[in-house]
């Protein structure tokens, strides 16, 4: 079996963590978030070829059925396996508050 | 905000649970599973338009950045939110054993 972390499509083309620089405006947050003004958003991007970072048995099944019925069953998809928390300074009716979000920034990725 | 469960693309086109009938051969299990010979595989298939079954804040961010940079950031993807367990009768060196898998069949779906 191929190494689950070695991309057969070439370096950087398979499912992995990417960082995208985004402003509050880009994120649609300008009306309710004060800080940070810009965010280094980590997200999971890339292809999910056979056996690459398969999250579980379901991902294996999906890949096998995708090969058989590509028009019916899509290939597994690159999604976060876990998240890093992030604190936002939010606007409120009376001022600001601190709020930590646990599901905002991807920490690592796998194929499901 | 649009209803998170109403598909703007038309009935059945957005992220939802589908059932695919598959044999042991289809699944690539014939060499290590004895039963069942066929499985009703439940999996998550369909598009993830804006605000549809968004799993979390990360999915919202991803959709916003996808609209801004569609060539860089893919749209959120339809994946299992939870799983149903399944028992398999597996071949062993000496005969068979029962094994329950918790991550095999999708139970419900969301967009990440």
């Amino acid at each position: 079996a191929r190494n689950g972390d070695r991309c057969p499509l070439g370096p950087g083309r398979c499912c992995r963590l990417h960082t995208v620089h985004a402003s509050l405006e880009d994120l649609g947050w300008a009306d309710w978030v004060l800080s940070p003004r810009e965010v280094q958003v980590t997200m999971c991007i890339g292809a999910c070829p056979s056996q690459f970072r398969e999250a579980n048995m379901h991902a294996q099944i999906k890949m096998n059925l995708h090969r058989l019925k590509p028009d019916t069953v899509p290939a597994p998809c690159c999604v976060p396996a876990s998240y890093n928390p992030m604190v936002l300074i939010q606007k409120t009716d009376t001022g600001v508050s601190l709020q930590t979000y646990d599901d905002l920034l991807a920490k690592d990725c796998h194929c499901v | 905000a649009r209803n998170g469960d109403r598909c703007p693309l038309g009935p059945g086109r957005c992220c939802r649970l589908h059932t695919v009938h598959a044999s042991l051969e289809d699944l690539g299990w014939a060499d290590w599973v004895l039963s069942p010979r066929e499985v009703q595989v439940t999996m998550c298939i369909g598009a993830c338009p804006s605000q549809f079954r968004e799993a979390n804040m990360h999915a919202q961010i991803k959709m916003n950045l996808h609209r801004l940079k569609p060539d860089t950031v893919p749209a959120p993807c339809c994946v299992p939110a939870s799983y149903n367990p399944m028992v398999l009768i597996q071949k062993t060196d000496t005969g068979v054993s029962l094994q329950t898998y918790d991550d095999l069949l999708a139970k419900d779906c969301h967009c990440v």
Epitope: - | S35, V39, N84, P85, L88, I89, L98, L104
Partner: antibody, heavy 118, light 107 residues
Framework: QVTLKESGPGILQPSQTLSLTCSFS??????????VGWIRQPSGKGLEWLAN???????YYNSALKSRLTISKDTSNNQVFLKISSVDTADTATYYC??????????WGQGTLVTVSS | DIVMTQSQKFMSTSVGDRVSVTCKAS??????VAWYQQKPGQSPKALIY???YRYSGVPDRFTGSGSGTDFTLTISNVQSEDLAEYFC?????????FGGGTKLEIK
């Protein structure tokens, strides 16, 4: 560790309804492929399959007894129930419940003796 | 209904011997046959699945074979603890049916 335990009235009279309960642990009836079956065995005789119920609530009955049998489940409490109406002395037997996986009875309970007598 | 016939109600053997218990289905059941062991005063215990696959924990002296209509459970090097009744069962179609049982006696 899979365990099953049957409970019943012990003795009942002809024409009454026999109610049996199977309480189990170590598996769930919400698992795809999992079922529970009932089998009985008159003293000194062979095994007779009565009914089974599957994870998806499919139910199957012994054709000869179908009109008298009702099987049901309480998945959250890990219990399966069997009712046999209009019992007769011929229904005297040890009743077993068993974990059924794709038609195969992998684990059996200890059995409960039911006597039908006037 | 499919009838499972175990023609020998009793079989006598000695410790260390090899014995074969047979079962015949009234119609083709493929390999959808299981075997169970029931010791005196106990509930049945699964031995064989799909005609020839030993269940985990079952000693390798128990071997199943056959397909179609004729099935055999062979016990090689019989031990005293093998004193029991042996039942076959088909699960090819409903209603599920058992053989009448074969009692193994140890001389």
């Amino acid at each position: 560790q899979v365990t099953l335990k049957e409970s019943g009235p012990g003795i009942l009279q002809p024409s009454q309804t026999l109610s049996l309960t199977c309480s189990f642990s170590g598996f769930s009836l919400s698992t795809y492929g999992m079922g529970v079956g009932w089998i009985r065995q008159p003293s000194g005789k062979g095994l007779e399959w009565l009914a089974n119920i599957w994870w998806n609530d499919d139910k199957y009955y012994n054709s000869a007894l179908k009109s008298r049998l009702t099987i049901s489940k309480d998945t959250s409490n890990n219990q399966v129930f069997l009712k046999i109406s209009s019992v007769d002395t011929a229904d005297t037997a040890t009743y077993y419940c068993a974990q059924e996986v794709y038609g195969w009875f992998a684990y059996w309970g200890q059995g409960t003796l039911v006597t039908v007598s006037s | 209904d499919i009838v499972m016939t175990q023609s020998q109600k009793f079989m006598s053997t000695s410790v260390g011997d090899r014995v074969s218990v047979t079962c015949k289905a009234s119609q083709n059941v493929g390999t959808n046959v299981a075997w169970y062991q029931q010791k005196p005063g106990q509930s049945p215990k699964a031995l064989i699945y799909s005609a020839s696959y030993r269940y985990s924990g079952v000693p390798d002296r128990f071997t199943g074979s056959g397909s179609g209509t004729d099935f055999t459970l062979t016990i090689s090097n019989v031990q005293s603890e093998d004193l029991a009744e042996y039942f076959c069962q088909q699960y090819n179609s409903y209603p599920l049916t058992f053989g009448g049982g074969t009692k193994l006696e140890i001389k």
